[in-house]
Interface confidence: low
């Protein structure tokens, strides 16, 4: 028996295509590129029907439906714009991912353009089906310092000019150290900030001496020391990592990393600092910030900063030789021979940064570590040298500039 003539579906074809079909003849229905066979609400690549003994087809011809890539995946710290009218997500439609500028930028300067493929997947020429990555922009504060030739004896920092500074605070709100934001979920600070004072009789660092992640919190976007700030973000701590070669007696490798429980929202008041690209030049001017003690042993109301020069390593070693204190290669010194400008108690772990004038970007040089009293003549502030431990920092955090 002969079966009725078949019409191929719109955007599809029938194979084999012949004038007449008889009992037991089979037909394969397929669709054009970018379309799928739709039968009983089920999508498939092909559909087969057969001419039956009674001269009818075993099934109705299915329809061809355009492939739909559906809503594209959300991009963390990014936005999606549709290039097609009516926000179409069907075959050959185009979308563009972009990052939340100016606080995030796309890794490898990817175009961010994705096209809906015939397979129903959003595809990028370089990344394939993988989403792009929005990386935090580092060291580019929205508010720049009013340039002054020098800062004498420290001065209050202008709000928003040090957006990478972190306050390490006890849960009752009492600050105890500083730190710097790296990437979107790490704080670099001093290792000595993360443990109790050791017993001078037995100065061995034990696990029980370490602060637990739940003993303190991180506050970003902070300006005032104790007063609340509408820009501040309070973040829990997931994990702490002290440098494996940290020596609490000599302060060698006095650096630690704090992983945040959640990522802060980057904005004009919260932005990471860049890791150093190379070694620091002696004589270069650096800025040190913190909420630590000032002269007269008073704590300031707001964030303070000082501008001081990097000091030659051998000069610093000689200054501390009479005190039998070692200034090792993982340390960097800064300050002025006459004294008067220095970090002090409570500044520990806080940032020492320098401006790369060509790029207009700020880089982390060191973290406040130790010294002989504060601001003493012929004594310099000693900082943990970030360049020396950059590989370790990058290995633990995965942060790249």
């Amino acid at each position: 028996n002969e079966c009725p003539e078949l019409q191929p579906p719109v955007h599809g074809k029938i194979e084999p295509s012949q004038a007449k079909y008889f009992f037991k003849d089979q037909v394969l229905v397929s669709c054009d590129t970018g379309y799928k066979v739709l039968k009983d609400n089920v999508e498939m690549d092909t559909f087969q029907i057969e001419c039956l003994k009674d001269g009818t087809w075993s099934n109705k011809i299915p329809t061809c439906k355009i492939v739909d890539c559906r809503a594209p995946g959300e991009l963390e710290h990014g936005l999606i714009t549709f290039s097609t009218r009516n926000n179409l997500t069907t075959y050959k439609s185009e979308i563009k991912y972009s990052c939340q500028e100016p606080y995030y930028k796309m890794l490898n300067n990817n175009t961010g353009i994705y096209t809906c493929s015939a397979q129903g997947v959003w595809m990028n020429k370089v990344l394939g089906r993988s989403l792009p990555t929005c990386l935090p922009v580092c060291g580019l504060p929205k508010f720049s310092r009013k340039l002054m030739a020098r800062i004498f004896n420290g001065r209050p920092a202008q709000k928003g000019t040090t957006p990478w500074i972190a306050m390490l605070s006890h849960l009752n709100g009492q600050p105890f150290c500083g730190g710097s934001l790296l990437g979107s979920s790490w704080i670099v600070t001093a290792a000595h900030c993360l443990h109790q004072s050791l017993d001078p009789e037995d100065p061995t660092l034990r696990d029980s001496d370490l602060l637990s992640p739940s003993d303190f919190k991180i506050i970003l976007g902070k300006h005032w020391r104790l007063r609340s700030d509408e820009n501040e973000q309070h973040l829990g701590v997931k994990h702490t990592t002290l440098h494996p070669q940290y020596d609490p007696n000599t302060f060698e490798n006095d650096v630690a990393l704090v992983e945040l429980l959640e990522s802060p929202v980057l904005n004009a008041f919260v932005m990471p600092i860049c890791l150093p690209e190379g070694p620091q030049q002696e004589g270069a001017m650096v800025i040190v910030s913190g909420w630590g003690k000032q002269f007269l042993q008073r704590f300031p109301e707001t964030l303070m900063e000082i501008e001081i020069p990097i000091v030659d390593h051998s000069t610093c070693q000689k200054a501390y030789a009479p005190l039998k204190k070692k200034v090792t290669r993982d340390m960097i010194c800064a300050g002025e021979k006459e004294g008067g400008k220095d970090a002090c108690a409570g500044d520990s772990g806080g940032p020492m940064v320098t401006l790369n004038r060509e790029r207009g970007q700020w880089y982390l040089v060191g973290t406040v570590s130790w010294g002989d009293d504060c601001g003493k003549k012929d004594r310099y502030g000693v900082y943990s040298y970030i360049h020396h431990n950059k590989d370790w920092i990058q290995r633990v955090t995965g942060v790249r500039n």
Epitope: L171, S212, S214, K217, L261
Partner: antibody
């Protein structure tokens, strides 16, 4: 160990103070939580105090009716405006790790003290 | 406050079988969750903290997993002694506040 005391039968509106007594550890090094359990029901968190600093936090449903405070070796839970809904066994519990609030769970629980609010 | 939604409310298992209890937090609480066991007329006992760390003295057949908003307690090779009600708890710190909310509990019966 920790042990609660002070639970009894009271009429609605009567204030009541429960006491949590610690022994074998320095209460100042730990956060002490109060948790309650109505008959046949689940556990309900009330709040906590970190004794060294005196910092307290409460569940939002407490709405100022309960206050947690401390002495040198005890932590008190002062309860006001009691209703029949507050009938429960009240537990105090210590966090596993010392040094402030620790997200290490409550490792040391008292046997509980029963508070019955009835007219 | 954070809401901890625990499922199922009750479960029955044969000795040697596996029990899985889930807890969903209403917001990301990182690894700040704990699990407790409570037998009738007894005080609760800490089983798991930090989402996956086994508390001291807890048999290794108990395990915890998850982070963010989804947490799971698994009892592999269930014993008669495991019949109890199990509770999840948030131990979350954020923005100067602490949350210790418990889930509604799961009653485990052994067949």
């Amino acid at each position: 160990s920790v042990e609660e005391s002070g639970g009894r039968l009271v009429t609605p509106g009567t204030p009541l103070t429960l006491t949590c007594t610690a022994s074998g550890f320095d209460i100042n090094n730990y956060a002490i939580h109060w948790v309650r359990q109505a008959p046949g029901e689940g556990l309900e968190w009330i709040g906590y105090i970190y004794a060294r600093s005196g910092v307290t936090w409460y569940a939002s449903w407490v709405k100022g009716r309960f206050t947690i405070s401390k002495t040198s070796t005890t932590v008190d839970l002062k309860m006001t405006s009691l209703t029949t809904e507050d009938t429960a066994t009240y537990f105090c519990a210590r966090v596993l790790a010392g040094g402030g609030y620790a997200n290490t769970g409550l490792s040391l629980w008292g046997p509980g003290t029963l508070v019955t609010v009835s007219s | 406050d954070i809401v901890m939604t625990q499922t199922p409310s009750s479960v029955s298992a044969a000795v040697g079988g596996t029990v899985t209890i889930k807890c969903q937090a209403s917001q990301n609480i990182g690894y700040s969750s704990a699990w407790y066991q409570q037998k009738p007329g007894q005080r609760p006992k800490l089983m798991i903290y930090g989402a996956s760390t086994l508390a001291s003295g807890v048999p290794s057949r108990f395990s915890g997993s998850g982070s963010g908003t989804e947490y799971t307690l698994t009892i592999s090779g269930v014993q008669c002694d495991d019949a109890a009600t199990y509770y999840c708890q948030s131990n979350y710190i954020s923005s100067g506040s602490v949350d210790g909310t418990f889930g509604g509990g799961t009653k485990v019966e052994i067949k």
